[in-house]
Structures are given as C-alpha cells and as structure tokens.
C-alpha cells in the first residue's frame, strides 16, 4: 500500500562491528526520501537520518546508550517533494527491521597483535584492547571493558619453518607461551565470545612473526 510514487524499504539489515552500528536497506531511492526511527522494546521511537536519500543510517549513538537492550528500527518512505504525504492508511509507508541486541550480535572486529616479547623460552603476546564507541562517565570503553570475561582470545602460533599450528586461549589480552629456543615463531589471534550463539568469532588478526618490528627479544 502507500502513495503511488513511493515504495517501502526492504532488506533492512544491521551492520555492526565493535558496536559501530549502521542500518542498511534497499532500494536506492527514485523520487523518494527516507527517515529512520529506532526504539527499544519498551521505549519511545527516536527519529534519525531525516529525509535522507541514503540507504543507510548510522545508529551507533543510540545503541551505545545500552548495548544490552534489544532494538527495533523502522524506515519510512516519503515522496521526495512532499514529505507530508502519507500512505493509503493515512500513515507514511514504513518497514520494520529485525530486532538487534548489540551485546549479543555486534561483530567482533579483527584484532591486532600489539606486541610480543621473548624472554628465554617464553613469549608474552599482547593483544590490543580496542576502543569502542560505548561511553560511560564521558570515557570510551574498550572491548574488554564492555565484555569483561565473556571475551576470550585464541592465539595461533607456529614455527616459521613449519606449518603445524598450536593454540592457546586467554580471558585477558595477554598470552604467555613456551617456545623452543633459537626458533622464530609466527602469531595470529582471534577474538571469541564462547557464550554467543551467533557472531561468536572475529576474523583472524594479521600474522606477526618474530624477527620483525613488533617483537622484542631478551635472554
């Protein structure tokens, strides 16, 4: 239904990584504009991205207020030259998004190995604690601040001279692993939230190898 010259948005999709959250939809507008509203299950609707010709809307500022809430968005379609116009039922044409719970669903961004340090036959590997856009008391929280011990990292490591990989896990941002003296190793890490049912793992970090800049060696 709706006016003859507007079509309802469709394929509403949440794109979210480390809580940076954008709602995307189709179609590219022809003689129409969109406005987005977002709400929690029990809250009031808040309008964003007024009368836009974009087919995406950044809703990060809204969802970071409480990343454990479940959000619903809707996209309204209006004729480009007459945003007061409504559909046949007396309301603007709109389509609802799927529900979205940031804490449970935001994708984990690709982690970065911050440093590694060898002391004798042990190597300490540190994963960067990436800053998110979630704020408390006017400070931005890190991924660890938000997820606490729900977030673990898996380390994959192997001798530069072979392909056999070993793994280690930590619920902090540091690993301490045993290595063979005189051997160079390569490392990659992955963020994991084991308690999740979807989006449990990040992509693997870039590989870092001993003998390159990030490392430090001490006898």
């Amino acid at each position: 239904s709706g006016t003859t010259n507007t079509v309802a948005a469709y394929n509403l999709t949440w794109k979210s990584t480390n809580f940076k959250t954008i709602l995307e939809w189709e179609p590219k507008p022809v003689n129409q504009v969109y406005t987005v509203q977002i709400s929690t299950k029990s809250g009031d609707w808040k309008s964003k991205c007024f009368y836009t010709t974009d087919t995406e809307c950044d809703l990060t500022d809204e969802i970071v207020k409480d990343v454990k809430q479940t959000y619903l968005a809707r996209v309204f379609s209006y004729p480009a030259g007459n945003v007061e116009s409504t559909g046949s039922a007396g309301e603007p044409l709109y389509e609802n998004s799927p529900e979205f719970t940031p804490y449970l669903e935001t994708n984990l961004g690709q982690p970065t190995i911050q440093s590694f340090e060898q002391v004798g036959t042990k190597v300490n590997v540190t994963v960067e604690d990436e800053r998110t856009l979630v704020r408390r008391n006017n400070t931005f929280l890190s991924l660890r601040d938000v997820f606490g011990k729900d977030l673990i990292y898996t380390l994959y490591y192997w001798k530069s001279s072979s392909s056999g990989k070993k793994t280690a896990k930590t619920n902090t941002n540091e690993f301490l692993i045993d290595v063979d003296k005189g051997e160079n190793y390569c490392f990659s890490v992955q963020a994991v939230i084991p308690s999740r049912t979807v989006n449990r793992k990040s992509t693997d970090s870039p590989v870092e190898c001993m003998g390159q800049e990030k490392g430090e060696f001490r006898e």
């Epitope: 454990k68 809430q69 408390r136 660890r144 601040d145 606490g148 011990k149 619920n171 902090t172 540091e174």
Partner: antibody, heavy 117, light 111 residues
Framework: VEESEGGLFKPTDTLTLTCTVS????????VSWVRQAPGNGLEWIGT???????YYASWANGRFTISNDNAPNTVSLQVNSLAAADTATYFC??????????????WGPGTLVTVSS | ELDLTQTASPVSAAVGGTVTINCQAS????????LSWYQQKPGQPPKLLIY???TLASGVPSRFSGSGFGTEFTLTISDVQCDDAATYYC???????????FGGGTKVVVE
C-alpha cells in the same frame, strides 16, 4: 542504591537483605554486596552481573545467595545459618562495568546486621 | 586466591604535601589493570576514586591519581587537604571468574 533495614538476629537465623536501585538498569550494570565488621576493613561477598550470573568469595561457602528474580530493580542477599562473625554493616554497590570488575561506583548507605543470642 | 597487601597504617601527611599508598597483589590482577581505589570516612560508605588502575572516577579531584600494572599499584594524593583524612582501600578483579578482593585498608592522617 539503598539497602533494606538490617537489625538484630539470632545465631542460625536466615537473613535476607534487599538492594533497591533506581536511575539505571540491572540489565546493564552489576551489583555487588560488600560487608564491613565493626572496626574492620571491607570484605567482598559476591556480585550478580548484568547477565544475571553470580560470583562469590571463596569464604562465602554456600551460605550466601545473591539473586534478582523477586522484583525489578532489586537485588537480594540471603545469608543462611547466621553466626556472630556475620555481624557487620552490609553494603550493596553498582559495578561500573556490569561484570565482576571490582569498580563499584555507586554505594548504598549500608545497613547494620547484628547477630547475637 | 587473590590477596591484596596495602601500605601499613597509619600514614601521616602534611597539608599541601603528597601521600603515596601502595597495593601489592599476590598475582596479576585481571588483565593487569582492573584495580580500583576507594576512600572511606567513618560512618560513610566507600567512595570510588580510581578505576582501571589510573582512570579518575567522576567528580573526584585531579589531586588523586593512580598508577601501576600487573601486581604493583599506587595511589598518590598530591596537595593533601584536611578533608583527605580517611581510610583508603584497593580492590581488584582477578582472572578467575569468582575472585574479587579488597586490600586491608590504609588510614591516612592529615596533620
């Protein structure tokens, strides 16, 4: 954040304290219980995190139960088999991060519980 | 089990001076930095001063600062005021799910 009134209890009694919170959601912040015996330091009892999971000090040995299933915006502490050593001021406090982080940014005034025969 | 040992009480300080209180953990605190500092005055609940080792809590004067990593942490009060007379506690989370602990407290006396 405010604790319910304590009072005088007898050994072996069961104590239930409630912590009522306002202005924030228990789905986003955790709540910890901490006690302080007269003239002594602070002692962490346990925490219920924003996902409803509970964590306890090793000495709490099953006598202490924290829950938030009775009413919205309340967290309860139950202590079974009270002993004189449980005499203390009991505080509830909000965990800033929502998990068991030790960063408690809003505290109740505390309530005195005295255990005596 | 996580054990936090603080500077012995009491610690005396002169108005305008500087006070340093140490907190040593028996093992690394969670992620090496989830340690907090509290101030408590008689008859009052504790007040959060510092969290995550060095982040100043909301409304706390910048005279208070925290530092440290792993097992060794320090609370520094500079330009000490009479109002700073209190007992100070450190508290930390540990990697084991169940463990959070307070230090024994350090009483600061301002002369």
């Amino acid at each position: 954040v405010e604790e319910s009134e304590g009072g005088l209890f007898k050994p072996t009694d069961t104590l239930t304290l409630t912590c009522t919170v306002s202005g924030f959601s228990l789905s986003y912040y955790g709540v910890s219980w901490v006690r302080q015996a007269p003239g002594n330091g602070l002692e962490w009892i346990g925490t219920i995190d924003s996902s409803g999971r509970t964590y306890y000090a090793s000495w709490a040995n099953g006598r202490f139960t924290i829950s938030n299933d009775n009413a919205p915006n309340t967290v309860s502490l139950q202590v079974n088999s009270l002993a004189a050593a449980d005499t203390a001021t009991y505080f509830c406090a909000r965990d800033f991060y929502g998990w068991n982080s030790g960063a408690l940014d809003i505290w109740g005034p505390g309530t005195l519980v005295t255990v005596s025969s | 089990e996580l054990d936090l040992t603080q500077t012995a009480s009491p610690v005396s300080a002169a108005v305008g001076g500087t006070v340093t209180i140490n907190c040593q953990a028996s093992q690394s605190v969670y992620s090496n930095k989830y340690l907090s500092w509290y101030q408590q005055k008689p008859g009052q609940p504790p007040k959060l001063l510092i969290y995550k080792a060095s982040t100043l809590a909301s409304g706390v004067p910048s005279r208070f600062s925290g530092s440290g990593f792993g097992t060794e942490f320090t609370l520094t009060i500079s330009d000490v005021q009479c109002d700073d007379a209190a007992t100070y506690y450190c508290a930390a989370a540990y990697s084991d799910d169940s463990d959070t602990a307070f230090g024994g407290g350090t009483k600061v006396v301002v002369e």
